[in-house]
Amino acid sequence: EPPTACREKQYLINSQCCSLCQPGQKLVSDCTEFTETECLPCGESEFLDTWNRETHCHQHKYCDPNLGLRVQQKGTSETDTICTCEEGWHCTSEACESCVLHRSCSPGFGVKQIATGVSDTICEPCPVGFFSNVSSAFEKCHPWTSCETKDLVVQQAGTNKTDVVCGPQDRLR
């Protein structure tokens, strides 16, 4: 009886089960009653990452430097090229098809998490006792200066954007 279902890594064609081509190879011709499935390795800059019956291999992804992309991992016959972004940039999507400049944290906000090639800068508002007076993609919120430890007193209170201003203590007259 002709099969209605085939084993893993096989496919049904013309009432018979044929072996799929292994990753890194494409289908040249289906099996027959006399021959096995004929497969050929993918060419340079091509890949197939699954057991398959594809007649064409996929092209490796191109990491376009004009889009801020560079190669993170070179593709093989079984894997696609993995792109990442140049320093200071991050991917706009999981597929990393283009890059955007890392966001900077405005004054009053500090960097909670520095950006990577795949994620943007995460900012957080500076809490009481901390400040940031610059727009930066790296600077965290800094603690206000402790006037007391310097034997000084606060002359001007700090904000989320400015440090405290310390001054000498008033002398008793």
Partner: antibody, heavy 117, light 107 residues
């Protein structure tokens, strides 16, 4: 018991035709692909033709394509090989074989074809 | 066309000895190779299929190995009835091709 019995061989002049037959028994003939393989005197094995179980698909090497035709009659459990424009180099024992698991799992005893003037 | 080259052409051994026959393919054929035995005046018979799979009714002293381009048929201990010609055959792609054969003869 699987049996393959070839017939139709003999002496034939160059340029003439010959039809070989293979009578199959002991298995469901219509479920199996079949092939012809030949062996020139004192030489190795050479594949000549194959036909799918239903008879829809046929396969030949380049050196016999156009001169040989493989066919089958599933109602008669018989395989055929029609050979035309015979040459001296076609002289050989012709074996009928069954395709089981993509192997030639059963062979007939062979029939000798001699092409000579 | 895939060319199969068998070596040696002739192997002269004594009963009880181990026989190692080689078959090399001109390109990778994965494990798509069969081995056949032919005794004088007889039709060939299938010994090993898919390079290493044993056939029911074939003595366990016959074994096959290899994948890609290099294949081996081993007869662990030769019996008098094993002296014959051995052929490899590929079924990876059309046309089906055989090796030229290795004759195992009594020394």
């Amino acid at each position: 018991e699987v049996q393959l019995v070839e017939s139709g061989g003999g002496v034939v002049q160059p340029g003439r035709s010959l039809r070989l037959s293979c009578a199959a028994s002991g298995f469901t003939f219509s479920n199996y692909g079949m092939s012809w393989v030949r062996q020139a005197p004192g030489k190795g094995l050479e594949w000549v033709a194959s036909i799918s179980s239903g008879g829809d698909d046929t396969y030949y090497p380049d050196n016999v394509k156009g001169r040989c035709t493989i066919s089958r009659d599933n109602s008669k459990n018989t395989l055929y090989l029609q050979m035309n424009s015979l040459r001296a180099e076609d002289t050989a024992v012709y074996y009928c074989t069954r395709a089981g698991g993509k192997a030639m799992d059963y062979w007939g005893q062979g029939t000798l074809v001699t092409v000579s003037s | 066309e895939i060319v199969l080259t068998q070596s040696p052409a002739t192997l002269s051994l004594s009963p009880g000895e181990r026989a190692t026959l080689s078959c090399r393919a001109s390109q990778s054929i994965r494990d798509n190779l069969h081995w056949y035995q032919q005794k004088p005046g007889q039709a060939p018979r299938l010994l090993i299929y898919y390079a290493s799979q044993s056939i029911s009714g074939i003595p366990a002293r016959f074994s096959g190995s290899g994948s890609g381009t290099d294949f081996t048929l081993t007869i662990s201990s030769l019996e008098p009835e094993d002296f014959a010609v051995y052929y490899c055959q590929q079924f990876n792609s059309w046309p089906l091709t055989f090796g030229q054969g290795t004759k195992v003869e009594i020394k």
